[in-house]
Each structure stands twice: as structure tokens, then as C-alpha cells.
Interface confidence: low
């Protein structure tokens, strides 16, 4: 029967002389070479030869255990005289012996992680992984320890598992973005002697609302004239947030002042400024100048980040209003109605007319009164300007025919002496009536109740 | 070659709790998390929470917090998922699934187990 | 918590067609999003990570795009095994997925 025992290579073996392998042997050898040994089978011939007299087996080429760890030969005893076996063919293996010949790989070259800012410690960011092609069944060639060679004190690696957590607290994006780690994978366990390889994980501090909106200044200055109109932007205001994204949102409002009422303010979502605008009409001769509490505030707010104080801030506006000059109006109402009787004389007095002029009287207004260009000429009546801001309606002919017209509808003009000059023209209706000979009314038609604005034939 | 295999399909009354077995194999069990996702009949999938075989850490979706737990058994490289006082809107398939190395909090998920059909029906 | 809007919620192609899926998160996710595919009664198969990297051993004619808050799942030219339903899922912060899009035989 055949005698031998389990065979072992040691890989990457670096010797001049062939590598012995083992010795094939039959209990029917005698040693008088009557016997002859063949191998056959894995690389038999090639990589594996035998001493047909001896049975004694040699590597002939250098082996790679990651290239192939088995090698299945058979072996066979035959006497040489009859040329017929004296053992059954028999199957045997050589079995490659690991050395530590092979570190561990990555299996990224990069790796790319995110992690939120202000985590706290031990935070999980990734979990690298490298690969040992040596044999993990024997020995500690495979056994992968992991070690953070730069990236300290920002970050820790479990070195079993090669998973990557932060390990100081308060880690501020604002501060610092991005961190380059190089972690080592080295095997025997980590050991003297064991072969390493490395890899690099780019961490990207993701950003959490951990700052609150800043207004640069505390004091906003604006002027508008009083004939804006509502809706019109005055102004606009910026707070900065050191945060990105949602994070760096900012809303805007109005929280306290005079102006309250008068003003808005609106959030400009592309540029994240604050546009004042005008809510209500403005008067410069009653107010003109409004002061306004701005509130900036993140909409989307970390409460555990609370404790850093209120996520908002705010800043005063002052909004001066600008003087229009504005022309000179009829004081009591937009238009003067009056009458007159049908048997009036000429020259009667029959309205006087007041004007007032909105604008701060700086030198005392001055105004002057005069029918429109286009009912000056064959009027009805004339216009008497009394040179202290006020006029007569006089009668122009003796007696009006109701039922000829009813009604005469007199466009004047009231002028300033600002430079440049600013006119209003108002409506005075004057309606025909039948009176009694005491001069009181009796009678007037009633569709003079409603009048156009404009002139009417024969005013 | 990595393969998870999940226990059978389950029936289960409103009240009870059933617990759904995923044994790992080629892979190392305790180098990856591994998760626990769920599928409504005709609807979509649902993360239920993970966990980390190497020391046993845990985390839930906020929905399942207080009804679920996810252990792992690393002698025999099994993961299992508890639901407890179930209803009737917990009839699902179940899968278990490894989460790859890399990424951030345990990344995409590369294997899925068959998946485990838990009715609850009174 | 992260929502995740995929569409269309289903669409009708024929072998040969080019196909895009699309899907939303409603926040910034950068690159940390999957596409899987399912069959009835399977399990989910990963075909992309990272938005638009390729799982070994899937089909060149899947791709992926986007970055942020936008992403497109593409399929070149439809076999009749890719009549499927196709799930994105974010990993960015937690885990959720799209509510998937069914691909059916027009």
C-alpha cells in the first residue's frame, strides 16, 4: 500500500534548488529499482517532477497560493520488469502553505462621505473595508487592523470594522467644510512586520441651522416721496446667515414702530433681502418721518440649537418722506355747487370760492383764479379773484331760461405762485331755479343733483 | 456568494407580535448593517430601522418606535426583526436587507432576503 | 424627514422605447441616492448608487443622473425584462424611498 503523508508547500518559495515537496513511496519498493514512480495530474511534468527510482517530489517554479491554493495529482507504482502496477493509481493533494506576501487593499481608492455639523461624538460618517488576499484560515496574513493615520482629532476609525465617527464635539462647517482622512488597513492584526495599504476619505460637513441671521448694521436709512403708491419699494435691507440652503432662509417683518400700518416689508427669495414698501398712501404735511422695527428669522429652526439664543435679529429703519409739491384745491369739497335765479340781475354775486394748497406754507401761499381757457370766452358768468386766496362766481347777463338750460357747469382754475407753477382745475355747477320775488328758491331741476365733471354748452 | 434567507410567511391575529428570522451568508455578518424594510400589499417600501451585528446597535424609524426590535444572533449569522401589537395595516411582506460599506449612515442597500409575508387578520 | 417624489406613478412603453423616470427629494440629498427594481413577488434589485453609479453586473442601458435635490433613472432601449416597478431611495439622512413607477407593456 502506499506510504505518505499529507503533503504542504510554503509559497513564494526563493531558493536556487528546486523546492522538495515529499516523497511518493510504496510498501512494495524494496529499493532495488524494480519499481518506477509516475506522477500525473496539477502541473505534474511542469511544476511538479519526480525522481522515478526515489518517488522523491520537487517544485520546478516558484507558487502563488492566491493564484492557486490546491494542486490534485495521482500518483502511480509500476515494476518495471512486467511493466504493471503494483499499487492502485492514487489521487493526493499538495496544498500551498500561505506566507504574508499580499497587503490589504481598499476597495476604494476614495472614499466620499457627509456628516453633519455639530454632531455629537461617535457619530457613524462611513464604514471603509479592505480586502486581505492571504489566507484568513491560517495565521494573522489576513487579520485587517484599522488605524486613522491623518484625520485626528476631527475623527476616530473602529479598527475591527473600519467604521469612521467623529470624535470632537462641535465640528463647525462654518468654520471648516471639508476634511481629508487617510485611513491605514494592516494585517497581521496589525502587528510589527505586517504589510499595510491606505485610502482616503473625503468627509463633507454638511450644514444644520446653528447660525442665526445677522443684520450688519442696526440702523436703515430711507427717503420716498409722499406720491408713492402702495406697493412701491423703498428700500432694501439685508441680514446674513452664515448657514447655506434652507438653513440660511430668511423671512422678514415688520414688528414694531409709527409705521406699523404704512409700511411692508417683503422677502426677495433670490437674494434673500428684506424689500420695504409702501402699504398706505403717504402725506408729508402730516407725517414725515416713520420709524420701523425689521425682524430677520430663520423659518426652519433646530430647536436643539435654541440654547445659542433667539434665531433672529433685528434693526431699525427710518423712513424720511420726501415733499411733493402738490397744486392748490378747492378747500371745501372736490366741486362747489350753487344757484342762481331766473331773474337774476348781472354782475350778482352768487359763490364764493376757497382754496387751500397741502404743501407747508414756507412764504404764505398765493393763489390765483381764472375760468378755463376753453369756457373764458362767451361764458355765462365771470370768475373774480380777490386776491386773498379767494373768488366770486358773478352773474354775466340778466336772467337764465331753466328750461333752455338747467344747468352750467364752470371749470376754474386755481394756480400757485410756486416755481414751477402747480394748478388744479375744479367744477362749479351752478343750477337755474325758479325763485319768488323775494329771491328764494322754489323750484330746480332735479338731474342737476348728479353732474359730470366738464364743461357744458353755454357755461 | 452573499445570500440572505428569511423565515416562512406568518398569520397573526390584531394584539400579537411575530418575529421574522434573515440568516446571512457569504459575507462577513458583523462588517455590515443590516437593515429591515416593508411592503404594504400594492404599495410602497418602508424603512423600518437597522442594525449593527459588530456591537448591536440599533435605530428606528420614529413611525415603529416602541413596536419594533432588530437583533442579531452572531454565532449563527442571523438577524431578526420583532413587531409587536400588530394591526391590521401591519400585514406586509418583510425583507431584510445589508446595507454596502461606504456611504453615509450605512448607504444603499446591494442584497435583499426573498422577503416574509406577515398577515394579521383576525 | 426627507420626502421622496417619484414620476410618472406609471407609464406604458414598448420594447425598444427609451424610458425616464424621474424623482424629487425635498431637500438637498447631493449624490446619496438608489434606484432599485422589483418584479411582483421579488425582492427590490439594486441597479444604481450614488446617483450615477452603475451596480456590477446590471445592464449598461440603465443610467443615472442628478445631484441635489433633482434625479432621472433612464433605460436606453426597453427589454421585455425591464417591465418592472423602479423605486428611488435617499441615504443621506435616514432612509426613504420614492413611491415607486410601474412600467408597463403599451
Known amino acids: 500500500s502506499w506510504m505518505w503523508n499529507q503533503f504542504f508547500l510554503l509559497e513564494e518559495y526563493t531558493g536556487s534548488d528546486y523546492q522538495y515537496v515529499g516523497k511518493l513511496h510504496s510498501d512494495q519498493d524494496r529499493g532495488d529499482g524494480s519499481l518506477k514512480y509516475i506522477l500525473s495530474g496539477d502541473g505534474a511534468g511542469d511544476l511538479f517532477i519526480i525522481n522515478e527510482n526515489t518517488g522523491d517530489i520537487q517544485a520546478t517554479k516558484r507558487l502563488d497560493r492566491e493564484e492557486k491554493p490546491v494542486y490534485i495529482l495521482r500518483a502511480q507504482a509500476i515494476n518495471r520488469r512486467t511493466g504493471r502496477p503494483v499499487e492502485p493509481e492514487s489521487e493526493f493533494i499538495i496544498k500551498i502553505h500561505d506566507i504574508n506576501d499580499n497587503e490589504p487593499i481598499f476597495t476604494k481608492e476614495v472614499y466620499t462621505a457627509t456628516v453633519p455639523e455639530m454632531s455629537d461624538v461617535g457619530t457613524f460618517v462611513v464604514q471603509v473595508t479592505a480586502t486581505d488576499a492571504d489566507d484568513p484560515t491560517y495565521g494573522n496574513s489576513a487579520k485587517v487592523v484599522y488605524s486613522i493615520l491623518q484625520g485626528q482629532p476631527y475623527f476616530s476609525v473602529e479598527s475591527e470594522t473600519g467604521i469612521i465617527k467623529t470624535a470632537l464635539l462641535n465640528m463647525d462647517r462654518e468654520n471648516r467644510e471639508q476634511y481629508q482622512v487617510v485611513i491605514q488597513a494592516k494585517d497581521m492584526g496589525g502587528q510589527m512586520g505586517g504589510l499595510s495599504g491606505t485610502t482616503t476619505v473625503n468627509i463633507t460637513l454638511t450644514d444644520v441651522n446653528d447660525n442665526p441671521p445677522r443684520f450688519p448694521q442696526s440702523t436703515y436709512q430711507f427717503k420716498t416721496p409722499e406720491s408713492s403708491p402702495p406697493g412701491t419699494p423703498i428700500g432694501r435691507i439685508k441680514a446674513s446667515d452664515a448657514d447655506v440652503g434652507e438653513n440660511a432662509e430668511i423671512e422678514y417683518s415688520i414688528t414694531d414702530g409709527e409705521g406699523l400700518d404704512m409700511f411692508d416689508v417683503i422677502t426677495d427669495q433670490e437674494t434673500q433681502e428684506g424689500i420695504i414698501t409702501v402699504k398706505k398712501l403717504l402725506d408729508f404735511e402730516k407725517k414725515k418721518v416713520y420709524t420701523l422695527k425689521v425682524e430677520a428669522s430663520n423659518p426652519y429652526v433646530e430647536p436643539r440649537f435654541l440654547y445659542l439664543g433667539p434665531f433672529k435679529d433685528s434693526a431699525t429703519v427710518r423712513i424720511v418722506v420726501e415733499d411733493v409739491d402738490e397744486p392748490p384745491v378747492f378747500e371745501f369739497a372736490e366741486f362747489y355747487e350753487t344757484f342762481v335765479c331766473e331773474k337774476a340781475k348781472a354782475d350778482q354775486l352768487i359763490q364764493t370760492l376757497h382754496a387751500v394748497d397741502k404743501d407747508d406754507p414756507y412764504s404764505g401761499h398765493q393763489f390765483s383764479f381764472s375760468l378755463a381757457p376753453e369756457a373764458a370766452s362767451g361764458s355765462n358768468f365771470t370768475i373774480q379773484d380777490n386776491k386773498d386766496n379767494t373768488a366770486g362766481i358773478l352773474t354775466r347777463k340778466n336772467g337764465y331760461n331753466r328750461h333752455e338750460m338747467s344747468t352750467y357747469l364752470l371749470p376754474v382754475v386755481i394756480s400757485d405762485n410756486d416755481y414751477p407753477v402747480q394748478s388744479s382745475t375744479g367744477t362749479v355747477t351752478v343750477r337755474v331755479c325758479a325763485c319768488d320775488h323775494h329771491g328764494n328758491m322754489q323750484s330746480c331741476h332735479a338731474e342737476a343733483l348728479i353732474h359730470p365733471t366738464g364743461l357744458s354748452t353755454g357755461a | 456568494e452573499v445570500q440572505l434567507v428569511q423565515s416562512g410567511a406568518e398569520v397573526k391575529k390584531p394584539g400579537a407580535s411575530v418575529k421574522v428570522s434573515c440568516k446571512a451568508s457569504?459575507?462577513?455578518?458583523?462588517?455590515?448593517?443590516m437593515h429591515w424594510v416593508r411592503q404594504a400589499p400594492g404599495q410602497g417600501l418602508e424603512w423600518m430601522g437597522w442594525?449593527?451585528?459588530?456591537?448591536?446597535?440599533?435605530e428606528y424609524n420614529q413611525k415603529f418606535q416602541g413596536r419594533v426590535t432588530i437583533t442579531a444572533d452572531r454565532s449563527t449569522s442571523t438577524a431578526y426583526m420583532e413587531l409587536s401589537s400588530l394591526r391590521s395595516e401591519d400585514t406586509a411582506v418583510y425583507f431584510c436587507?445589508?446595507?454596502?460599506?461606504?456611504?453615509?449612515?450605512?448607504?444603499?442597500?446591494?442584497?435583499w432576503g426573498q422577503g416574509t409575508l406577515v398577515t394579521v387578520s383576525s | 424627514d426627507i420626502q421622496m417624489t417619484q414620476s410618472p406613478s406609471s407609464l406604458s412603453a414598448s420594447v425598444g422605447d427609451r424610458v425616464t423616470i424621474t424623482c424629487k427629494a425635498s431637500?438637498?440629498?447631493?449624490?446619496?441616492l438608489a434606484w432599485y427594481q422589483q418584479k411582483p413577488g421579488k425582492a427590490p434589485k439594486l441597479l444604481i448608487y450614488?446617483?450615477?453609479t452603475l451596480q456590477t453586473g446590471v445592464p449598461s442601458r440603465f443610467s443615472g443622473s442628478g445631484s441635489g435635490s433633482d434625479f432621472t433613472l433612464t433605460i436606453s432601449s426597453l427589454q421585455p425584462e425591464d417591465f418592472a416597478t423602479y423605486f428611488c431611495?435617499?441615504?443621506?439622512?435616514?432612509?426613504?424611498f420614492g413611491q415607486g413607477t410601474k412600467v408597463e407593456i403599451k
Open positions: 450614488d446617483a450615477n
Open positions: 442594525i449593527y451585528p459588530g456591537d448591536g446597535e440599533t
Open positions: 436587507a445589508r446595507g454596502v460599506y461606504g456611504g453615509f449612515a450605512g448607504g444603499y442597500f446591494d442584497f
Open positions: 431637500q438637498n440629498i447631493y449624490k446619496n
Open positions: 431611495q435617499q441615504y443621506y439622512s435616514g432612509w426613504a
Open positions: 457569504g459575507y462577513t455578518f458583523t462588517r455590515n448593517f
